[in-house]
């Protein structure tokens, strides 16, 4: 029985050109995490394998950095990066847990209604 839950950073609104950290945390289970996949829609961004370490997809190498931890750092954000990101935890013996984060990237000139943009 799958007892675990995934906590995420929550949805994020950020400025074009900035960078953000996407993070998920698996709790309430003793299952062993064998691999974490990070995906956007149907595209694989990165894999963190318990034995083999990190692999960043070639098309994202310039703008995606591993970590912190099992998280992912997205840099040089563009409006086209707007969308849903998935952290997919492969565990044994539980199976797969998925977390979801929506990232909204806004033009730098847009500071609508005084929104506080996140640029770490």
């Amino acid at each position: 029985m799958m007892t675990g839950t995934i906590e995420t950073t929550g949805n994020i609104s950020a400025e074009k050109g900035g960078s953000i950290i996407l993070q998920c945390h698996l709790s309430s289970t003793t299952a062993q995490v064998t691999q974490v996949n990070w995906e956007q829609q149907d595209q694989l961004l990165a894999i963190c394998n318990a034995d083999l370490g990190w692999h960043i997809s070639p098309s994202f190498k310039d703008r995606v950095a591993p970590g912190p931890g099992l998280g992912l750092t997205l840099q040089s954000l563009t409006v086209n990066d707007t969308g849903e990101y998935f952290c997919i935890y492969h565990t044994y013996p539980d199976g797969t847990y998925t977390g979801r984060i929506f990232l909204e990237v806004l033009e730098s000139s847009v500071a609508e209604h005084g929104a506080r943009f996140q640029i770490p």
């Epitope: 906590e7 995420t8 950073t9 929550g10 949805n11 994020i12 609104s13 950290i21 993070q23 829609q41 409006v79 086209n80 707007t82 969308g83 849903e84 979801r100 984060i101 929506f102 909204e104 806004l106 033009e107 847009v110 500071a111 609508e112 209604h113 929104a115 506080r116 943009f117 996140q118 770490p120």
Partner: antibody
Framework: EVQLQQSGPELVKPGASLKISCKAS????????MNWVKQSHGKNLEWIGL????????SYNQKFQGKATLTVDKSSNTTYMELLSLTSEDSAVYYC????????????WGQGTSVTVSS | DVVVTQTPLSLPVSFGDQVSISCRSS???????????LSWYLHKPGQSPQLLIY???NRFSGVPDRFSGSGSGTDFTLKISTIKPEDLGMYYC?????????FGGGTKLEIK
């Protein structure tokens, strides 16, 4: 002036599919997400999902995955929601609503489309 | 999914009253950067819902200052300082911090 004009009321048979439209005007269409919300029985509101016209990115409430499909036609500033395999549970008023940039809220709403599923 | 609980379900009022509506979430609505995406809406009969408050406490354009929002973490409140006839209807809070976005069950503001 921001306006969202939705298609008219629909009476459809169980098992059928239906496409509702939401035509936007008065703002830069591609720069804002468009959300869809269901209101059943005159009370509770449920978020179905959203689409970002700029790149076509979508996000769905998993409850509606396989039930609703969101698409966009940038040339006509129109967002569509297709509802599949309709049952009486899908009878409701459906709203499109523009996303408020930077705040994950909805600032302007369409007038709603009433859908009745009945044989 | 994040569960959003609104109280009370029904709120009988007299014009001129001050009222509060509570909205509680099953987990914190602050994201990892400290931003909280909690908004309030009024849905009047025969109309579309309208945005009142976004980001906990920001009044949307054209919303009278008798409406105010407050709170943090998991507990949020909408206050209406002097009830007017046009304020009657269903009030909903919405959390947009976690996927999927979820609404509270609604509070019906009606005349005593």
């Amino acid at each position: 002036e921001v306006q969202l004009q939705q298609s008219g009321p629909e009476l459809v048979k169980p098992g059928a599919s239906l496409k509702i439209s939401c035509k936007a005007s008065g703002y830069s269409f591609t720069g804002y997400t468009m959300n869809w919300v269901k209101q059943s029985h005159g009370k509770n509101l449920e978020w179905i999902g959203l689409i970002f016209p700029y790149n076509g990115a979508t996000s769905y409430n998993q409850k509606f995955q396989g039930k609703a499909t969101l698409t966009v036609d940038k040339s006509s500033n129109t967002t569509y929601m297709e509802l599949l395999s309709l049952t009486s549970e899908d009878s409701a008023v459906y709203y499109c609503a523009r996303g408020l940039r930077g705040y994950f809220a909805m600032d302007y709403w369409g007038q709603g489309t009433s859908v009745t599923v009945s044989s | 999914d994040v569960v959003v609980t609104q109280t009370p379900l029904s709120l009988p009022v007299s014009f001129g009253d001050q009222v509060s509506i509570s909205c509680r979430s099953s987990q914190s609505l602050a994201n990892s950067y400290g931003n909280t995406y909690l908004s309030w809406y009024l849905h009047k009969p025969g109309q579309s819902p309208q945005l009142l408050i976004y980001g906990i406490s920001n009044r949307f354009s054209g919303v009278p200052d008798r409406f105010s929002g407050s709170g943090s973490g998991t507990d949020f409140t909408l206050k209406i300082s002097t009830i007017k006839p046009e304020d009657l209807g269903m009030y909903y809070c919405l959390q947009g911090t976690h996927q999927p976005w979820t609404f509270g069950g609604g509070t019906k503001l009606e005349i005593k």
